[in-house]
């Protein structure tokens, strides 16, 4: 059988290194030898390259080496396969070296900001030594912020006469670290160099960008003062590495700027104690280059009626997100503040908040929330400077079975009845919404019975028991993930009715 005809011939000119062609089939079953015939010097010369040599690399690849690599030039390439049965030649292919030239990557030697020019980095590089001197090179510059996985790209060309190998990358974020890498190719070539080694540079700092400001209103104290927990953070879209030196806060009762008080802090939270009137609060951040725009917040009077417009709210889980959606009766409201924090028996250690604009839903990645924890989520409508009544819900991003079952006791033990009571499982051990409780009970050496009740029931009267019989009992609390049994208790029904008899039970 003749060898297969060599096809899919592809050639690449590694500038001043070699001219390499590959083809298929890459592996011949039988005893096959390949020869590559080349014409060069615009057809005036010819030579041959063969796969049978001492460095038997890829069987379906052959390289022509200097000094017979001439550039510029047009080559013809034909691959010949020979086995014991004969010879098969490929079609003749035609190659313009300028179109298939691959050069070394450039070397970036600096990525620096230019004094006084905001949001720009100047990249300087060395043109590859192994590149044709007279040719225009095209470049792709890839860049990303240091903590991002996503590259952005910009393309440009440089004439050979541009000895200044620099590029100004603009419209960046202020005071942000960027990673850069560069590749190049002769303008007519289809093959790019590899990427250069990465280099890092930081854009110039600017005055802070702005703040998002929020508050938690706490109940008034005995002396009538209201604690208000202020909190602020960099505005959405602020530069990643913007660095504030501190924050200035000033506040006063509405229509009475004479009573302005000021606070300076380096924290991103501050507790104020305000009177019962309406107050206005202002916060700016500052650094060595100046101040941010002012963030403003109106704290309503203690007796102010707040508007209510959220009619319903749903929390649902997708594969990797928690999505909260709400319905509003006020179409003019298009800004909302979302608060979320773990529902724990003690004071929540982490409290988070985020502004939502021009949407009636809020999304958070599941991995930003802890599994098996219940989160309180509240949404406040914001209309200009007024904050409306919140609407709240609870959600788990992942439910599990409770860490402990209910603590149970038997009360009012009678001849044929008993009242079972149990305590709610502590929030920290629920691991999900309790759907129901199941009471399992059985007489000594008897059949087990069960009774399931809703999650809002914490007491149940069992009837039709057998007199003067020992029973064991436990209560299981169930979430969507499954149930966990509480401790087993034992009790014995009475032989005759003792209305004033106290029965001691075991846990």
């Amino acid at each position: 059988v003749l060898p297969a005809k060599p096809e899919n011939i592809s050639c690449i000119f590694y500038y001043e290194e070699n001219f390499t062609c590959t083809w298929s089939p890459e592996k011949e079953a039988s005893y096959t030898w390949y020869k590559v015939k080349r014409t060069y010097s615009y057809g005036y010369k010819s030579d041959i390259c063969s796969t049978d040599n001492s460095t038997r690399g890829n069987h379906a690849s052959c390289s022509f080496l200097p000094p017979t690599i001439t550039n510029p030039d047009n080559y013809t390439i034909q691959v010949e396969a020979q086995n014991a049965d004969g010879i098969m030649k490929s079609d003749i292919t035609y190659w313009n070296l300028d179109a298939i030239m691959k050069i070394e990557p450039p070397e970036i030697f600096s990525v620096k900001s230019v004094l006084g020019i905001k949001r720009m980095l100047q990249i300087k590089w060395i043109r590859p030594v192994l590149a044709p001197h007279s040719s225009t090179l095209k470049y792709t510059l890839r860049f990303r912020t240091i903590n991002s996985a996503y590259w952005m790209e910009v393309n440009f060309t440089k004439e050979d006469i541009d000895r200044d190998e620099t590029y100004n990358l603009t419209e960046l974020q202020a005071f942000t670290e960027y990673v850069m890498t560069l590749r190049c190719a002769p303008a007519e070539s289809m093959f790019w160099s590899g990427w250069s080694q990465e280099k890092v540079g930081t854009t110039e700092e600017e005055a802070p960008y702005g703040l998002d400001l929020w508050r938690v209103l706490k109940p008034a104290m005995v002396d009538g003062r209201r604690p208000v927990q202020l909190m602020w953070k960099k505005a959405t879209g602020a530069p990643v590495l913007e660095k504030a030196l501190g924050y200035n806060i000033w506040y006063f009762p509405e229509n009475n700027t004479n009573l302005t008080e000021t606070v300076n802090t380096t924290n991103q939270t501050h507790e104020l104690y305000l009177g019962g009137k309406t107050y206005w609060v202002y916060v700016v951040s500052y650094n060595s280059l100046g101040e941010s725009p002012v963030a403003t917040l109106r704290i309503p009077a203690l007796n102010e009626k707040t508007f209510q417009c959220i009619e319903a709210m749903q929390a649902c889980l997708t594969q990797d997100q928690l999505v909260v959606e709400w319905q509003s009766s006020a179409p003019e409201v298009d800004t909302w503040m979302v608060e979320w924090f773990p529902d724990v028996d003690s004071e929540p250690s982490s409290f988070s908040w985020e502004s939502v604009s021009q949407a009636r839903n809020w999304t958070i990645q599941k991995d930003e929330l802890k599994p098996l924890w219940c989160y309180n989520i509240s949404v406040y409508p914001v209309l200009r400077d007024r904050v409306g009544q919140p609407y709240s819900t609870q959600a788990y991003v992942q439910e599990g079975i409770p860490s402990a079952g209910p603590v149970t006791q038997a009360d009012s033990i009678g001849v044929k009845t008993v009242t079972i009571t149990w305590k709610e499982i502590p929030k920290s051990k629920r691991n999900g919404f309790i759907k129901n409780y199941t009471i399992f009970y059985q007489a000594e050496d008897g059949k087990e019975f069960s009774k399931t009740v809703n999650s809002n029931i914490l007491q149940y009267r069992l009837e039709s028991l057998t007199r003067r019989t020992s029973y064991s009992l436990q209560v299981m609390a169930s979430t969507n993930a499954g149930g966990t049994n509480g401790t087993k208790i034992n009790f014995k029904t009475l032989s005759i009715s003792h209305h004033h008899h106290h029965h001691h039970h075991h846990h």
């Epitope: 003749l2 005893y31 096959t32 030898w33 020869k35 015939k37 030579d47 041959i48 390259c49 063969s50 049978d52 040599n53 001492s54 010949e80 020979q82 014991a84 049965d85 004969g86 010879i87 030649k89």
Partner: antibody
């Protein structure tokens, strides 16, 4: 200038052996496949053997397979053919030729097989 | 094996005359695998035409080759004295690689 010079031809008895050599110059010997072609006394040309440039692949017609062995020494730019179990029909002028297709031929060396 | 039959075996032509000789294969040969050689008495064969129609280096342009499949030919547009020789066709496609019996061209 490409030059191929054959040697080793002789008068040999049937069943005997002979080794032909071909010294190459004027081109990169290790890049080219090489062949032996013979011309019988009645002027017919016959392909006898082919070897790849590195010597890994060898090809023969059935008429000589198992009796003739083509080989090469790229360090010495020399092609060889070991012939054994010679028959009277092997009598011919033997030429070494550069492949792709045979484009350059030597002047030949004469082999006569006769008792 | 592919048998190549050349005709005529011997032919003579006057100087300036157009000459055509043929080579017929017993089974199809690709056009890029059919070659012609020229041999003069006392010399080794020289590659004359390769891949059916391409003239080897130094071959006068009065020579041409054509053909496909099983039928090939060599033509001299105007015979000259130095063209007197034996011409062999050769297929370098299927093993065993074979040669035609030759056409001997003489001057009339």
């Amino acid at each position: 200038e490409v030059q191929l010079v054959e040697s080793g031809g002789d008068l040999v008895k049937p069943g005997g052996s002979l080794k032909l050599s071909c010294a190459a110059s004027g081109f990169t010997f290790s890049s080219y496949g090489m062949s032996w072609v013979r011309q019988t006394p009645d002027k017919r040309l016959e392909w006898v053997a082919t070897i790849s440039n590195g010597g890994s692949y060898t090809y023969y017609p059935d008429s000589v397979k198992g009796r003739f062995t083509i080989s090469r020494d790229n360090a010495k730019n020399t092609l060889y053919m070991q012939m054994s179990s010679l028959k009277s029909e092997d009598t011919a002028m033997y030429y070494c030729a550069r492949n792709e297709p045979p484009d350059y031929w030597g002047q030949g060396t004469s082999v006569t097989v006769s008792s | 094996q592919i048998v190549l039959t050349q005709s005529p075996a011997i032919m003579s032509a006057s100087l300036g005359e157009r000459v055509t000789m043929t080579c017929t294969a017993s089974s199809s040969v690709g056009s890029s695998y059919l070659h012609w050689y020229q041999q003069k008495p006392g010399s080794s064969p020289k590659l004359w035409i390769y891949d059916t129609s391409n003239l080897a280096s130094g071959v006068p342009v009065r020579f041409s080759g054509s053909g496909s499949g099983t039928s090939y030919s060599l033509t001299i547009s105007s015979m000259e004295a130095e063209d007197a020789a034996t011409y062999y066709c050769h297929q370098y496609h299927r093993s065993p690689y074979t040669f035609g019996g030759g056409t001997k061209l003489e001057i009339k």
